[in-house]
Interface confidence: low
């Protein structure tokens, strides 16, 4: 009876990777391509379809669309590739492989998809009146991962860790963890990203700076003194111009002049 | 015995037109995906342009996209390569090469080639 | 385009020899390669498709390995009916692109 095999019924590939997947039949002496026939199949989405020697790519379902292909020199081989570039997470499932050569049979292969949380945005910004540091860890990956704050000194820190969907991928998470802490120069924290799925745990170290400029979170402080201040230096400006020249338009540029030159520097601390 | 023989090539002026014919035979020339290349003097090969058999695909090289045209007349079991707007790279023995089975690619059959020189 | 970077250009070979032609893409082209060997005065002809499977009649000194971004072509006991132009083809994107060749002469 024509059988088919595979060395492989479950295949896992990292988000963005690459993936083949191999169906056996066998071919005796030389092939003939106009007897062969090669389907790749995923939950209902044509992925394959070749027939009489020719890859009708009319029928492959859009999602694949320049991403999956037969490698037809392996079919020389008795092997049906299917390579997958590029893997998404929705490509997560079973497939089938159906050839007919003579005889037909098909066959079932596992894909799972994983994404590590592996590049990890990170940010330490600082509280001038407290003095305390707010760390901040930021990655996306899939499943779900949970992220735990230690110390340099293996102490377990509690910290604040909200999940959002990625824009980049609808089932790829976004997970941010924010950490708040009294810290002293050159402290060394840890987040790691722990995941439900395979065992695969990714950390950043981060290392409390010499000297932090004021974060972006701090022009409350402003927003709140900026007014009076402004006011007061109004007023000072307004009795001094008048004072000295008397003229409304004198007034005008010097009062113009005094904002113009009131800049500030808020700068927040970014590593990634 | 396959066999294919390539016409039509001689000295033709820059901007003018050419056409190439190569007749095969020894095969069912409908069954298989047909090719040009050519090869300028000295120098190496330069895949031009591929026919699937039904003739609804056709590929062509960067080169001489939008100049060259392939076709082929079943029937008659002749490959074309119609040239337009000559230039002097294009100088070069042009090759009918026929696909070792039904493929685009695995140019396992070649003609003697027909020269082509572009020259004012 | 995907660049196909044959090495040497030429080789000056004994009766004997083994011989190894390289050749390097521009980027990862699986296996779909080719190797052709042209003489002196002849059209090409195809020895080696998807970079390991020697065509039907061709000696088995010729040998094609490798996949992605760099092949090779041995020839493991060098004749002197071997001494031809060599050259490499990749065929995964459009354009196809030749190798530059590489030129086996004798000593």
């Known amino acids: 009876a024509f059988t088919i095999t595979v060395s492989k019924d479950l295949y896992v590939v990292e988000y963005g990777g690459n993936v083949t997947m191999e169906c056996k039949f066998p071919v005796e002496k030389q092939l003939n391509l106009f007897a062969l026939i090669v389907y790749w199949e995923m939950e209902d989405k044509k992925i394959i379809q070749f027939v009489n020697g020719k890859e009708d790519l009319k029928v492959q379902h859009s999602s694949y669309s320049q991403r999956a292909q037969l490698l037809k020199d392996q079919l020389f081989l008795g092997k049906a590739a299917l390579q997958i570039t590029d893997v998404r997470l929705q490509d997560a499932g079973v497939y089938c492989c159906l050839i007919g050569y003579g005889g037909a049979d098909y066959k079932r292969i596992t894909l799972k998809v994983h994404a590590p949380y592996r590049n990890i945005s990170q940010r330490i910004s600082v509280d001038p009146v407290t003095s305390e540091h707010e760390l901040m860890c930021q990655a996306e990956g899939y499943p779900e991962a949970e992220v735990i704050w230690t110390s340099s000194d293996h102490r377990v820190l509690s910290g604040k860790t909200t999940i959002t969907n990625s824009n980049r991928e609808e089932k790829l998470f976004n997970v941010t963890s924010t950490l708040n802490i009294n810290a002293t120069a050159n402290e060394i924290f840890y987040c790691t990203f722990q995941r439900s799925g395979p065992e695969e745990n990714n950390t950043a170290e981060l290392v409390i700076p010499e000297r932090l400029p004021v974060p972006a979170s701090e022009r409350t402080h402003f927003m709140i003194l900026g007014p009076f201040l402004l006011l007061l230096g109004v007023v000072l400006a307004v009795t001094f111009c008048l004072k000295k020249h008397g003229r409304m338009m004198d007034v005008e540029k010097c009062c113009t002049r005094d904002r113009n030159s009131k800049k500030r520097n808020d700068i927040q601390f970014e590593e990634t | 015995e396959v066999q294919l023989v390539e016409s039509g090539g001689g000295l033709v002026q820059p901007g003018r037109s050419l056409k190439l014919s190569c007749a095969a035979s020894?095969?069912?020339?409908?069954?298989?995906?047909m090719a040009w290349v050519r090869q300028a003097p000295k120098k190496g090969l330069e895949w031009v342009a591929s026919?699937?058999?039904?003739?609804?695909?056709?590929y062509y090289g960067d080169s001489v996209k939008g100049r060259f045209t392939i076709s082929r007349d079943n029937a008659k079991s002749t490959l074309y390569l119609q040239m337009n707007s000559l230039r002097s790279e294009d100088t070069a023995t042009y090759y009918c090469?026929?696909?070792?089975?039904?493929?685009?690619?695995?140019?396992?059959?070649w003609g003697q080639g027909t020269l082509v020189t572009v020259s004012s | 385009n995907t660049v196909m970077t044959q090495s040497p250009t030429s080789m000056f070979i004994s009766v004997g020899d083994r011989v190894t032609v390289n050749c390097k893409a521009s980027?990862?082209?699986?296996?779909?390669v080719d190797w052709y060997q042209q003489k002196t005065g002849q059209s090409p002809k195809l020895l080696i498709y998807?970079?390991?499977n020697r065509y039907t009649g061709v000696p088995d000194r010729f040998t094609g390995s490798g996949s992605g971004t760099d092949f090779t072509l041995t020839i493991s006991n060098m004749q002197a009916e071997d001494l031809a132009v060599y050259y490499c083809?990749?065929?995964?994107?459009?354009?196809?692109?030749f190798g530059g060749g590489t030129k086996l002469e004798l000593k």
């Open positions: 090469a026929r696909s070792a089975w039904n493929y685009p690619y695995w140019f396992a059959y």
């Open positions: 020894g095969f069912t020339f409908s069954d298989y995906y």
């Open positions: 026919i699937s058999y039904e003739d609804s695909s056709t």
């Open positions: 980027q990862n082209v699986g296996t779909n």
């Open positions: 998807g970079a390991s």
């Open positions: 083809l990749q065929y995964n994107y459009n354009p196809w692109t």
